[in-house]
């Protein structure tokens, strides 16, 4: 299963920094409970 990334990790909304939880690098387990890679 592939994981995808937002195209920017942080965006300013009304002067508030919002973290896009998925833009954190490929295949690092950003999606809760999604099996990524193999057993390591």
């Amino acid at each position: 299963d592939a994981e995808f990334r937002h195209d920017s990790g942080y965006e300013v909304h009304h002067q508030k920094l919002v973290f896009f939880a998925e833009d954190v690098g490929s295949n690092k387990g950003a999606i809760i409970g999604l099996m990524v890679g193999g057993v390591v």
């Epitope: 939880a21 387990g29 950003a30 999604l34």
Partner: antibody
Amino acid sequence: QVQLVQSGAEVKKPGASVKVSCKGSGFNIKVYYVHWLRQAPGKGLEWIGRIDPENGETIYTPKFQDRVTMTEDTSTDTAYMELSSLRSEDTAVYYCVSSGYWGQGTLVTVSS
Amino acid sequence: DIVMTQSPLSLPVTPGEPASISCRSSKSLLHRNGITYLYWYLQKPGQSPQLLIYQMSNLASGVPDRFSSSGSGTDFTLKISRVEAEDVGVYYCAQNLELWTFGQGTKVEIK
């Protein structure tokens, strides 16, 4: 068998702190993020935050920002979640999740 | 915070019959990259939750294809084409466009 094994149930007084552990068994915990969630009795799921064990980077939900600390010990494949200034509303089952694996949950009861 | 609202909160089902759960988000979960950041989880009785669907329509590994999900930016539906006894539990929708928030859950039980 690959699994995440959490520490046992805890009973704490209001104002105290609790530290829950999550150990990877047959699983290298430093490769993937470790998420922490909780579920109060009869309630839904609530995300607390996550840690990248590779570099210690954390992201916390603003609600918990001032009270939670997530750490890891890669030498023992164990992640930790410490919650301070406990109140009765923190009574819940706390879960760790990494990749497709979920811990069995740790019941934390806050009661005077 | 993005608020996720599910309906119904309780759903009695008949094995072999279809079932559907609705979820609405307070903000569009469709990002400009084309991905919709909507997820479905199932918590079976006495178990930890499990991921069913990720990014609105992708089936997680090992999830039977009787489960499917569709929707727009704010309105989503999880469908079970033919309910089986093992499908009982509490279903949660969730988003991670901005951190993670979950719906209040829909309890599915056999009639």
